[in-house]
């Protein structure tokens, strides 16, 4: 692969991690002790876009598997999934726009803010269990903040 | 303003291991999202990779040079060192140590250098 | 494996635009950078990303890269322009790769 990657897990402001949900799904809940071992593994490439000081424009692959989180029009809603992609051809520099999050780093906390759909970020519920999902608002209900743990290879 | 400070012996003899250390100021050599590098120039020459580490323990090396180089970190100091084992005079150079941020595919703070000689 | 080849010398008048290339198999495909190295020092990141320039670097570097080919230019160019210039990129089998140097000279 052309790109530089990096492993990683993340968890959201609450300490909830992420699980899969069926093949296409993320879900995120609170996992302790052996737990951990369910949670998804990212493989966070840094790929071209708009990069200010503090946006770095990333892709969100699952580890060894060739699914990445997209952003889509659902029913005229920006709608968070996992997209399957040919891993002969992926990750690549110049990544399609659906597959690209800008990493927004404020007080060593972390946002995935959709390039596709400006304003639109990774989000989870309060509640334990739920969908992780593409949220357009920011400081309500819903968790925009994540935090990222390094993973060796 | 990160800083970064090359050490070593500025004499090796031939065979035996070269051994620089980095010391990093301004920044923390364990802080996720970058890899700490070493290259060097022999005289009148190019840029030639040696090879990096990043997280406190993964690294990429130079196929050729893969069999000599041994990278590491001393969190504790905020430090990395370079050894390059049975050196020749064709390893006599200055070398450098840098900064590359994984987003950049670039190395922003190198630096100053030292000059190593291979010698009898 | 992966290799980077540039021109060993560029010559260009005060004023005038310069133009370095870079050229690797599909280096489009890959990212590129571009350093700046005055005698006795050490080199300087001017372009990184293929495009993008560090804080400090003036507009009149700028980058392209696509194809086989990334090119450096320098437009307006100074007698402080006159130096050595390396293109790098990153490559996963080989890692990270530089070009051999061109030695930009200002008439």
């Known amino acids: 692969a052309p790109v530089r990657s990096l492993n990683c897990t993340l968890r959201d402001s609450q300490q909830k991690s992420l699980v899969m949900s069926g093949p296409y799904e993320l879900k995120a809940l609170h996992l302790q002790g052996q737990d951990m071992e369910q949670q998804v593994v990212f493989s966070m490439s840094f790929v071209q876009g708009e990069e200010s000081n503090d946006k770095i424009p990333v892709a969100l692959g699952l580890k060894e598997k060739n699914l990445y989180l997209s952003c889509v029009l659902k029913d005229d809603k920006p709608t968070l999934q996992l997209e399957s992609v040919d891993p002969k051809n992926y990750p690549k520099k110049k990544m399609e726009k659906r597959f690209v999050f800008n990493k927004i780093e404020i007080n060593n906390k972390l946002e995935f803010e959709s390039a596709q759909f400006p304003n639109w970020y990774i989000s989870t519920s309060q509640a334990e269990n739920m969908p992780v999902f593409l949220g357009g608002t920011k400081g309500g209900q819903d968790i925009t903040d994540f935090t990222m743990q390094f993973v060796s290879s | 303003q990160v800083q970064l400070q090359e050490s070593g012996p500025g004499l090796v003899k031939p065979s035996e291991t070269l051994s620089l250390t980095c010391t990093v100021s301004g920044g923390s050599v364990s802080s996720g999202g970058y890899y700490w590098s070493w290259v060097r120039q022999p005289p009148g020459k190019g840029l030639e990779w040696i090879g990096c580490?990043?997280?406190?323990?993964?690294?990429n090396y130079n196929p050729s040079l893969k069999s000599r180089v041994t990278i590491s970190v001393d969190t504790s100091k905020n430090q990395f060192s370079l050894k390059l084992s049975s050196v020749t005079a064709a390893d006599t150079a200055v070398y450098y140590c840098?900064?590359?941020?994984?987003?950049?595919?670039?190395?922003?703070?190198w630096g100053q250098g030292t000059t190593v000689t291979v010698s009898s | 494996s992966f290799e980077l080849t540039q021109p060993p010398s560029v010559s260009v008048s005060p004023g005038q635009t310069a133009s370095i290339t870079c050229s690797g198999d599909?280096?489009?495909?890959?990212?590129a950078c571009w350093y700046q190295q005055k005698p006795g020092q050490s080199p300087v990141l001017v372009i990184y990303q293929d495009t993008k320039r560090p804080s400090g670097i003036p507009e009149r570097i700028s980058g392209s890269n696509s194809g086989n080919t990334a090119t450096l230019t320098i437009s307006g160019t100074q007698a402080m322009d006159e130096a050595d210039y390396y293109c790098q990129a990153w490559d996963s089998s080989t890692y990270v790769v530089f070009g051999g140097g061109t030695k930009l000279t200002v008439l």
């Open positions: 580490i990043y997280f406190s323990e993964s690294t």
């Open positions: 840098a900064r590359d941020p994984m987003h950049y595919y670039g190395m922003d703070v």
């Open positions: 599909k280096l489009g495909d890959k990212f």
